[in-house]
Structure formats: C-alpha cells, structure tokens
C-alpha cells in the first residue's frame, strides 16, 4: 500500500461583470492551501447574463437584479454548497454605468440598490456592488493578464519563487462604452492621474494607465452614426444594400453623442440611412473621433491625453480580439502587421451587404459594423496609441489565457480578496497533487 | 431534424394542478435552455419562464411564480412544466420552445428557434 | 416592464402587395426578433436580431429599426403569408411579445 493525498480543498470567488452591453458573471477557483502562489487562481466557470447591461435598465432596476438570477442559481450549482458561506461575491460595473451616472444619478444608485438587494438574498459571502472607475478597470485588467501569464513570480525548479526575467505585458481593453490601455512604465507620468504604483510580491510596479470613455465599440458606433447622420445623409461604413430606420432619439440620448446633437431635434423622429461601402470616407468618419491638436504634456495619445510611448508587449482583448477575430477567421484576411490590419478594414468596408452576408454565412447578426469596428481599431492602435509596426508586432489578441477570460474581474478578485499579497514569498515547497 | 414533441390537450378542474411535457429529439438536450411561453385564446404570447437543462436553474417571469414550476429528465430529454391551483384564466396553449443563440463580439444574443406544437390546457368543472 | 404595440392589429393585403407591419416599445430595445403563426400552429421564427433573415424563411420577408421603432416588410404578398405576426424582445426581462398582427389576403 501506499499514501495517497487526497487534493486540497478549494475555495471559491465570484465576480459579476456588470458591462455597458451585457453581465457575465466568472466564478474563480483556488487551493485553500496555496493561496499566496501566482498562478494559482483558475476560472472554474462562467455564464452570460440574458438581456442588456444593468445600465440599460435605469427604468425598470428591478428587472436589472431579475436578470442576474439564472446566473447566480447557476453558481448555487457551480459552488460546492459547504463553499457557499465563505465565497466572496462582487459586482463591478463598468463604463455603462459611469455614463448612467453622470446623466443619471439616481437612477445609478437605483439600479445599484436592487441589485444589492437581489444578491444580498443568496447564500454567498457579498461583499458589494459598485461602480469602477476608470482607472480601476484599466489596472485590473493589467493585473488579471500578468497573473494568468504568471509574469509577476514563478516557482523556479530549485525551489525558490524567482521574478521572471521577461517583464510584464501591456494590457489593452476595448469594452462597449469605454477602452482602457495600461503599461509598466520606467519614467514617471506627467500626469499623476494616470500613473498607479504597485507592490505586487515583494516587487514595485510604476504602471501608465488611462480609461477612454465613450470609445467602447458601441458608443463609438453611436457617434459614428451621428458623425454619419450630420454629415453625409448616409452611412459610409456600412455596406452598400443594407439601410435601416434610425430612431434620432436613440442616437443622441448618450452623453456620448451630445456634442453632435442637432439643438432642435424630434426625438421621435426616424430617419431611413443607408450604406455606401466606402472605405475611406470611413476612415475619415473614424478619425474624426481622434484629436490631435493640442497636447498640455511633452508627448500625447489623442484628445490632449498624456501617454508615454508603448513599450513592451501588450496583450489586446474582449473588442480588440473579437474585432480581430473576426477578420482572421471570418473573413480569413491576414492580420500580423498594421498594414495587413488596415488592408482587412478596408477589405471589409468594401463588401457589398450580399457580398457580406455571403461570405459570412451563419453569423449576419450585426455584421453591418463590422467594416466601422475593424476601422476604429486599427485607427486606435496606430493614430490614438502610436503603434508602429515593429510595436504592433508585440502585441496578441487573445480571449483567455490558462482557460480564463482576460479582463478586470480577476485581477479585481485578487486585490479584494488580498490573493496577491504585497510581500515576497519565503522559501517554499511546492507539492505536486498529480 | 429538431423536434419539441408536446401532447394535445389536458382538461383539468379548477383548483387542480397538471404537469405537461416536451420531448426534445434532434440535438444535444442539454445544450439549450428550454422556455415556456403561454397563448391565452385569440391573444398574444407571455413568457412564463426557462430551465438550464445542464444544472436544473430555472428563470421565471415574476407574474409566473408560484403558478409554474419547471423540471427535466435528462434521461429521457424531457422538460416539464407543472401548473397549480388552476383558475379559468389558466386555460390556453402552453408552447415549449428551445432557446437559440448567436454571438456577437462576444455577447449572447438569444430567440425562441423551434418550437413544440403546443398543449392545451381547458380548466373547467 | 417593456410594452410592445404592434400595428395594425389586422391588416387586409392583396396578393403581389409590398407591405409593413410594425412594433413600437416603451422603451429602447437593442434589437427585436419577428414570430409568423399560421392558424392552429406554433409560433415560426422569421426574422432574428431586427433583421436577419432565420433559416427557410423566403427573401421577400426583411426587418429594420432601432431604438423604439421596429419594422417587417413583405415585398411581395403571397398566399401562404395570411397568417399572425408578432414582434419579440430580449433587451431586458422580463421578455415581451407585441399583441400581434393578423395579415389577411383579399
């Protein structure tokens, strides 16, 4: 006979990600033993919340709690019930309710209230629901790639915990109401506001990050359907043969499109617009959306924002993979340079609608903005963020790394549940339970 | 070819309680939610509410709770639908309907694809 | 809880006609889907996300809207259209169905 260990006992964390568009909730799993580890913290499952974001419901917040709860049944399912009492559970909202927020106060707080009355009902430890800023969204999602790609520490064969010589991933977020680009940087930030230090096991950390609102892919589209509206009279990123009827009301309700906003309008008003499958007049359209006039700082993004120039690898995902993704394997056009990736925009503002829907069989669903979302993409990554093609050729566009979704919701776990502590690890021994 | 198999018709007195059943054949059963949605005589249709087939979650429409409970048996690739303290307003068509999807930039977006045939249920003493 | 108001509630077509049928909310919705039932059978899906086109469905039958304003439009009528339509939301729960449009043929 022979011992056999029986494997740790896990524990569990919850997070809903309250986005602009849609909810998902991750459940995260760990073992009780290990921790402080990095790396060791795994997606155990997820669930995609019907309907819109919490945010669309700022008339109706009861009916945002009602549709978490499929969801949250499933994580009564998911969870080990002797793991119920003691896992924590958080929802973080996004750019959606930040919006909300700033035209909208009470109805935030309202759609905040119900929803902590709904998750307050289930067994788990709750420990709140709130809205994150920018800032937060950005560096939470630095944090969740850099964990799961184990850049902070790793177990060396000798058994020590050793910092890998490799240094840490940029991470870039494109969300439906906002973009976050965040980077480990050496020299201070100009602005204070987008500079966050971090002490992450035993290791300073002088990160650049800044939250973009209103450049989420659906805002974007918003404005650029304004842009369309009061410009042309029809829509040049959408494809030749497809129209559509388009509620002004709709168009201009977001703080987003108030700068484009007719000052007499009827917001009952439709207006039939149509596509023209015009690459460059797209192009245009999209980078009207970009300022570059003036800049208080020694160096910019766009719209007078300080960056310092990208450096190092950087990780894109959720729009920014999806986008790409889309024209890789979709469209089957090759993307690994920039020129390559505004070859594939240009290609795909050009289809027809019956080209489009021809060569897309299967996934029409909104496949109209594509053509805008490839455009505004490769126009952020090249104008706003000052990718060249040699800093363009670190970047991946990636959903999950080691089976978990990349995005705020992990890195946001570890920090509140002090996963990551601040001081480095003593010497351990690692115990294989294979 | 999918298939929602749902049976004619049941006449219950009023205050009783009926169970009707959907038969899936054609796809993975526990692949899809299964939804219930009511047609009242000459009236439009009502969402009562869904069940995860996977982990036995269930989601009602609020005017539904209490009325509705649904159920499977993965075995057999059936939902269920129980209805109590049946009223005259209770008497319609109750549909069974398997829930689509697509993505979209990683969203899910979701519809009713196929349908049962429908079962009637006439509350009557 | 979204409200949705089809109209007409019955529309008289002759065969050959282009037509419209249409689906107000009460509130924004990010997309509508389209049901067709036909007399004494279950609901057929026809057009999901506002427009697009379910699988069999003829090319004569298109969707467009946005906002609170949805539309179905049949180009060119034909028999086998007569029949009940209904506009259908999944924005925000709890899920809704207009009261319908029954499209006759003269």
């Known amino acids: 006979t022979r011992d056999v260990r029986e494997p740790p006992a896990l524990k569990y964390g919850i997070v809903l990600d309250a986005g602009s568009s849609h909810t998902s909730m991750f459940i995260y799993k760990w073992p009780a033993d290990k921790e402080n580890d990095t790396g060791i913290v795994g997606q155990h499952s997820s669930c995609d919340v019907p309907g819109g974001g919490i945010s669309s419901y700022a008339d109706n917040p009861s009916g945002a709690s009602q549709s978490l709860v499929g969801c949250l049944e499933q994580a009564l399912q998911d969870v080990p019930k002797e793991r119920h009492a003691g896992t924590p559970l958080y929802l973080g909202a996004t750019a959606g309710m930040r919006l909300l927020n700033l035209t909208n106060p009470e109805a935030s707080t309202s759609v905040l209230m119900a929803v902590t009355h709904t998750l307050t009902q289930y067994p788990f430890d709750f420990r709140g629901a709130r809205i994150l800023s920018g800032q937060e969204e950005g560096v939470f999602g630095w944090v969740t790639a850099n964990y799961l790609l184990e850049n902070f520490i790793k177990y060396g064969w000798v058994g020590r915990w050793f910092r890998p010589r490799k240094g840490t991933l940029g991470a870039m977020d494109l969300g439906g109401a906002s973009t976050q680009i965040t980077f480990e940087t050496t020299s201070p930030a100009e602005d204070r506001a987008s500079e966050v230090q971090l002490h992450l096991y035993g290791q300073h950390y002088r990160v650049y990050t800044h939250s973009f609102l209103c450049y989420g892919r659906d805002q974007v589209l918003q404005r650029l359907l304004a842009s369309a509206l009061q410009t042309h009279g029809f829509h040049p990123c959408w494809p030749r043969g497809f129209s559509t009827q388009v509620l002004l009301g709709d168009v201009y309700q977001s703080p987003c499109t108030m700068a484009q906003r007719p000052q007499n309008f009827n917001s009952s008003a439709r207006v039939s617009l149509s596509g023209s499958s015009d690459p460059h007049l797209c192009r245009d359209l999209v980078s009207g959306l970009f300022s570059f006039s003036s800049c208080p700082f020694s160096r910019c993004s766009f719209n007078g924002v300080f960056q310092p120039p990208v450096a190092g690898n950087f990780v894109a995902f959720s729009a920014f993979f999806y986008t790409v993704d889309f024209l890789r394997t979709s469209m089957g056009l090759p993307v690994a340079t920039l020129q390559q990736l505004e070859a594939a925009a240009v290609n795909v503002c050009n289809q027809t609608w019956a080209q489009l829907q021809a060569r897309v069989p299967g996934q029409r669903a909104r496949l109209a903005d594509y053509c805008a979302g490839a455009m505004f993409v490769q126009q952020l990554l090249s104008r706003g963020y000052g990718f060249d093609e040699r800093a363009f050729g670190g970047v991946i566009f990636q959903k999950k790394a080691a089976d978990t979704a990349v995005g705020w919701a992990l890195g946001y776990m570890l920090n509140l549940t002090n996963l990551i502590p601040a001081d480095p690890p003593g010497l351990r021994k690692g115990t294989d339970f294979s | 070819e999918v298939q929602l198999q749902q049976f004619g018709a049941e006449l219950v007195k009023p205050g009783a309680s009926v169970k009707i059943s959907c038969k899936a054949s054609?796809?993975?059963?526990?692949?899809?939610?299964m939804d219930w949605v009511k047609q009242s005589h000459g009236k439009s249709l009502e969402w009562i509410g869904d069940i995860n087939p996977n982990y036995d979650i269930t989601s009602y429409n609020q005017k539904f709770k209490g009325k509705a409970t649904l159920t499977v048996d993965k075995s057999s690739s059936t939902a269920y639908m129980e209805l109590r303290s049946l009223t005259s307003e209770d008497t319609a068509v109750y549909y069974c309907?398997?829930?689509?999807?697509?993505?979209?930039?990683?969203?899910?977006?979701?519809?009713?694809?196929?349908w049962g045939a429908g079962t009637t249920v006439t509350v009557s003493s | 809880q979204i409200v949705l108001t089809q109209s007409p509630a019955i529309m008289s077509a002759s065969l050959g006609e282009e037509i419209t049928l249409t689906c107000s909310a009460s509130s924004s919705v990010s997309y509508m889907h389209w049901y067709q039932q036909k007399s004494g059978t279950s609901p057929k899906l026809l057009i999901y996300s506002t427009s697009n086109l379910a699988s069999g469905v003829p090319s004569r039958f298109s969707g467009s809207g946005s906002g609170t304003f949805y539309s179905l439009t049949i180009s060119s009528v034909e028999a086998e259209d007569a029949a009940d339509y209904y506009c259908h939301q999944w924005s925000s729960y709890p899920w809704t169905f207009g009261g319908g449009t029954k499209l006759e043929i003269k």
């Open positions: 309907a398997r829930r689509g999807f697509f993505l979209y930039y990683g969203s899910s977006y979701y519809y009713f694809d196929v």
């Open positions: 054609g796809y993975t059963f526990t692949d899809y939610n």
